[in-house]
Interface confidence: low
Amino acid sequence: ESKYGPPCPSCPAPEFLGGPSVFLFPPKPKDTLMISRTPEVTCVVVDVSQEDPEVQFNWYVDGVEVHNAKTKPREEQFNSTYRVVSVLTVLHQDWLNGKEYKCKVSNKGLPSSIEKTISKAKGQPREPQVYTLPPSQEEMTKNQVSLTCLVKGFYPSDIAVEWESNGQPENNYKTTPPVLDSDGSFFLYSRLTVDKSRWQEGNVFSCSVMHEALHNHYTQKSLSLSLGK
Amino acid sequence: ESKYGPPCPSCPAPEFLGGPSVFLFPPKPKDTLMISRTPEVTCVVVDVSQEDPEVQFNWYVDGVEVHNAKTKPREEQFNSTYRVVSVLTVLHQDWLNGKEYKCKVSNKGLPSSIEKTISKAKGQPREPQVYTLPPSQEEMTKNQVSLTCLVKGFYPSDIAVEWESNGQPENNYKTTPPVLDSDGSFFLYSRLTVDKSRWQEGNVFSCSVMHEALHNHYTQKSLSLSLGK
């Protein structure tokens, strides 16, 4: 016979059988690496029912409770549940030094509180090697060409890549996710698309990489038609 | 008061409140594109309880029930639940033509059967452009170098990339996941790592790409120290 029989009052409606779920997100890599930015750990609770909408957050850094988190107003979702977010600002050095951040969530729709913990990936940091690659000759028949930045050998996978030219940001780029390499490090590619004419005019394009294992957390490699000829 | 009260007999234990979950996986791109391979759609049921272990699968192709699926013996998981898998072999051309595959799962631990449907991504297929990129001069100071294959402009994202040299597979490569580009197509990079000596000796390395929008579903681009000089 089905487990569900005729449901009894102490059971939730089938569509919310699982109750709320909790997800804990790390800070953006760039935020942890630049002193001008504010790194944040974000705790997201989804599938909060309208009957029990109150969510309580408790935050701990290396097991010690902290009280500086900000909880945002709950947002109603299309499926008539709520999503609630709490954000903890962290110290750059604490994150880079591997401190553990715990978000504890309490809600009447849960049999007991849910705890999620996050920290920087453990292991010896490894410095990225950065190489720029010009467009293939075959691509030069097109109106736009691809400039490539290969970033390899880094650990952990937290990294930020950007492009610029003449001191101005270049925004028409896409970066692959980090890929685990056979030696346990990571690599990625970033691809900047530019008009062929800009490349042929000899403009210099630079790939900027931010990673904790780099000196000053930063390096930049340039690429142009004339460089390396 | 908590929804859970003292649980009643018609409710599952809290950790299995959701009952079984169903996941439907597409065939591997290479399997759909090569006549030598066997494309399969895979229906996976997890969190099947030991009290109600029997799972029934029904499969439908474009709404018509088919009976050639193979259900594997259930596997016990660490958390004392079962995982049950059913595999449907599909016709290459049916998948590429966009037929819909539905897996319907029945189990006493479910209030009603669960249906999951999968098909090839809809939309006009777009042919990949394939470009090979030699190692950066800066990388030539290392013992090993990176050969790069940029595959761009393709849709859908189902694709297979391999490397070979002298007719033999080269296995020391990694390929990024497809990345959604600004025009709605996808791109990726594949990186083959080879000993610098092999590159400097003038060996020819080839990047082979399989995608439905390619003539013959296949193309190959080569790369060597002498090519393009």
Epitope: - | M34, S36, H92, Q93, N216, H217
Partner: antibody, heavy 122, light 107 residues
Framework: EVQLQQSGPELVKPGTSVKMSCKAS????????LHWVKQKPGQGLEWIAY????????KYKEKFKGKGTLTSDKSSSTAYMELSSLTSEDSAVYYC???????????????WGPGTLVTVST | DIQMTQSPSSLSASLGERVSLTCRAS??????LNWLQQEPDGTIKRLIY???SLDSGVPKRFSGSRSGSDYSLTISSLESEDFVDYYC?????????FGAGTKLELK
């Protein structure tokens, strides 16, 4: 460049067996099906069977079941066909042929080997 | 098995002439038909796949077409190296079957 190199001519006695080879180069051996085709002197072509080196799966024309046995060796990128209980009817040129670059219409008999002549005679 | 009836079995023609060879399928084979060329030394080469698609490296004077169950190979202007044997091949269903062949001879 895709190449299929077949073993040399064979002169064999009736009732015996012969094993011929088809060595593939210029592509990944396990990615493509290899067909075998028979041509008797002055006659047309007849499909015998195929082997899929990826999983060693085979499919035979009904009349050749028990006559031919297909095998492959991934390490040397070579496919083999052994013919047994030979009679004069088995005297022919035997071709191996590779499928094309993918699945679909273009997949069939895209590349051909030069053939192996088998003569069955006392 | 699907029967492929190829005609003519032999054909005499002159250099520069346009010729057509035909295969008729006993059952529906869709576009699943190849045309093969066999030289006197036995070398076989695929010319046309999928009824009308030209293989790479094949001269454009070769073309393939279909009308119902009749499939044609046309050579628009014969050159000296074209006077060899031609076979059609269907692969719509197992076993693949070949036509009996056409011998193209120089008149």
């Amino acid at each position: 460049e895709v190449q299929l190199q077949q073993s040399g001519p064979e002169l064999v006695k009736p009732g015996t067996s012969v094993k011929m080879s088809c060595k593939a180069s210029g592509y990944i051996f396990t990615s493509y099906i290899l067909h075998w085709v028979k041509q008797k002197p002055g006659q047309g072509l007849e499909w015998i069977a195929y082997i899929n080196p990826y999983n060693d799966g085979t499919k035979y024309k009904e009349k050749f079941k028990g006559k031919g046995t297909l095998t492959s060796d991934k390490s040397s990128s070579t496919a083999y066909m052994e013919l047994s209980s030979l009679t004069s009817e088995d005297s022919a040129v035997y071709y191996c042929a590779r499928s094309g670059g993918g699945y679909g219409n273009y997949a069939w008999f895209a590349y051909w080997g030069p053939g192996t002549l088998v003569t069955v005679s006392t | 098995d699907i029967q492929m009836t190829q005609s003519p079995s032999s054909l005499s023609a002159s250099l520069g002439e346009r010729v057509s060879l035909t295969c008729r399928a006993s059952q529906d084979i869709g576009s699943s038909l190849n045309w093969l060329q066999q030289e006197p030394d036995g070398t076989i080469k695929r010319l046309i796949y999928a009824t009308s698609s030209l293989d790479s490296g094949v001269p454009k004077r070769f073309s393939g077409s279909r009308s119902g169950s009749d499939y044609s190979l046309t050579i628009s202007s014969l050159e000296s190296e074209d006077f060899v044997d031609y076979y059609c091949l269907q692969y719509a269903s197992y076993p693949p079957t070949f036509g009996a062949g056409t011998k193209l001879e120089l008149k």
